[in-house]
Amino acid sequence: NQDLPVIKCVLINHKNNDSSVGKSSSYPMVSESPEDLGCALRPQSSGTVYEAAAVEVDVSASITLQVLVDAPGNISCLWVFKHSSLNCQPHFDLQNRGVVSMVILKMTETQAGEYLLFIQSEATNYTILFTVSIRNTLLYTLRRPYFRKMENQDALVCISESVPEPIVEWVLCDSQGESCKEESPAVVKKEEKVLHELFGTDIRCCARNELGRECTRLFTIDLNQTPQTTLPQLFLKVGEPLWIRCKAVHVNHGFGLTWELENKALEEGNYFEMSTYSTNRTMIRILFAFVSSVARNDTGYYTCSSSKHPSQSALVTIVEKGFINATNSSEDYEIDQYEEFCFSVRFKAYPQIRCTWTFSRKSFPCEQKGLDNGYSISKFCNHKHQPGEYIFHAENDDAQFTKMFTLNIRRKPQVLAEASASQASCFSDGYPLPSWTWKKCSDKSPNCTEEITEGVWNRKANRKVFGQWVSSSTLNMSEAIKGFLVKCCAYNSLGTSCETILLNSPGPFPFIQDNIS
């Protein structure tokens, strides 16, 4: 058909930078390169209908559906989604093509469905159909990588049984300790499944897909180092593969390495050795102990011995089920307003945990650091001195753990007052919780020193406001004090704050903020 326009349908994925939710044709985000959705004429349809390839979008992702129309003259358009018509603002690009866009910000279930675009040009009318669905991530998995020996080769294969297929990379480091942090220049990454260079200090394999990134470290005993603070312990679940690498460097090749489990030599087929000369002509030997699928009886002390180095051991513990060991009793802290302080949780867990810190329904990323006594620690310092309840939550495939913390910030009370016809009330935050006094100001007591004790009601049943404790004191109006100025004062160990109230006849009450001592 000669007079049909040339149409191009594209999908633009955006990297969210937390822009507000809604539909718009402006671009508040960084864009990825457009993906052609190949708009094709739909056969056997009444009228001219183009159909774009189906679009699958991750939850919370932001996209733009865009149509480029190569047709002479002006065009007008209308978007229809779930029987509602949506505004459509066509514009023209540098090649004088009509451009119509629909931006979907932070994709949700309600935004999935069929988007119909009706276009009217001078020559003809036509419809474009987009089907947008949320990608089913329920079937997605990300499993921790494990190692296998490559058949007939001295090499390790890294395997992660994940959906979608993960990208596997080896993360190698040749220096000690802190300098092997992920972004350090000492770290080398290799995006491949097979690793032949197995002599490095620190070897990890990582797998990543849409669900995130999981890593497994090659457990290593280095006979040239002093042992860890505590006898190293390696946990595995029944059926998982065991890999331990023993490494030693010596001035010449005249040394050998052996593995023993509970003082019995490992069976042939459960170990293999590699050796190489380093740059300074010293000999590096590594001896791997491995079991392709561990059983309970593989538990025990694995000792690597050398004819030229002190031996070292590791305790391998095979468990039926993963665990998280930590004390879950809640902890209360009180700190000064400018005191440096971090919450911390020390735990032992297998497999590695995923964790979050939560405050006031907001979640914060959780970092964990392995200690060299087999425990791990997670610290949270980003509390910005906000009092309230903080929650640490951790889970792995087999266990869950939650720990509560309460943070109180020591500070002087701040008083707010309000009054009605029958009573005056004062409220104060501050910690420790303040005590209250009421004083009457009169001719006899211009400095407001006459204490009021009648009709005062202090509320110690504190309500939490944004995580802060609030204490209140109420003075019931009596004839004796009507028309007088009264002063409520809240005090704790850090100071006193007062508010003065005029108890006149019903009507608005002016409040005079007193000095805070």
């Epitope: 040239n224 180092q225 004819s307 180095h309 002190p310 051991s313």
Partner: antibody, heavy 120, light 107 residues
Framework: QVQLVQSGAEVKKPGASVKVSCKAS????????MHWVRQAPGQGLEWMGI????????RYAQKFQGRVTMTRDTSTSTVYMELSSLRSEDTAVYYC?????????????WGKGTTVTVSS | DIQMTQSPSSLSASVGDRVTITCRAS??????LAWYQQKPGKAPKLLIY???SLQSGVPSRFSGSGSGTDFTLTISSLQPEDFATYYC?????????FGGGTKVEIK
Amino acid sequence: QVQLVQSGAEVKKPGASVKVSCKASGYSFTTHYMHWVRQAPGQGLEWMGIINPSGGSTRYAQKFQGRVTMTRDTSTSTVYMELSSLRSEDTAVYYCARGSSYYYYGVDVWGKGTTVTVSS
Amino acid sequence: DIQMTQSPSSLSASVGDRVTITCRASQSISTWLAWYQQKPGKAPKLLIYAASSLQSGVPSRFSGSGSGTDFTLTISSLQPEDFATYYCQQAISFPLTFGGGTKVEIK
């Protein structure tokens, strides 16, 4: 037989340093860790640190961190322990002790000890 | 750090007596425990390692038992040369720590 021969007694002034040596014989020097343990007069045993003679790497007790240095010379099968900024409470007998071969952090053979007296 | 608590701090016994010394760790140390004997002016000597294994050359009257946090050194029949101070030591975690010692004296 296995022997650890330590250097002789030392008298030092507060603030000075002392370096005690321990010469090993009768076994393969690099196959056993070497520990240093001290004992103040009339007191119990106090672990100071460990050295791996094979690689020379060390680990010290927190209490001595920054003041103690352990080194080794594989050509003479000797380990050294140097303690600096001496104070009167460092007066003690200093022992080198060989780590047992299989038993993780155990000690199976001890030197005779070197008496270090810190006095002004 | 793991604390090691020995009891009693001293005891008096006669030749031929059965003597028991206990040692408690502040946390579980499995069987990573050693016992040493020290005589005045001498270096300590290893008696027992791995909680119950007798070091070669040590008389069989010495025996060790226990696991986790509670351990015992037993001298089945005290001999004159056994009057000395005995120390336990945890051997699983740095810093290595010793018990305060038990002095065995002649009654």
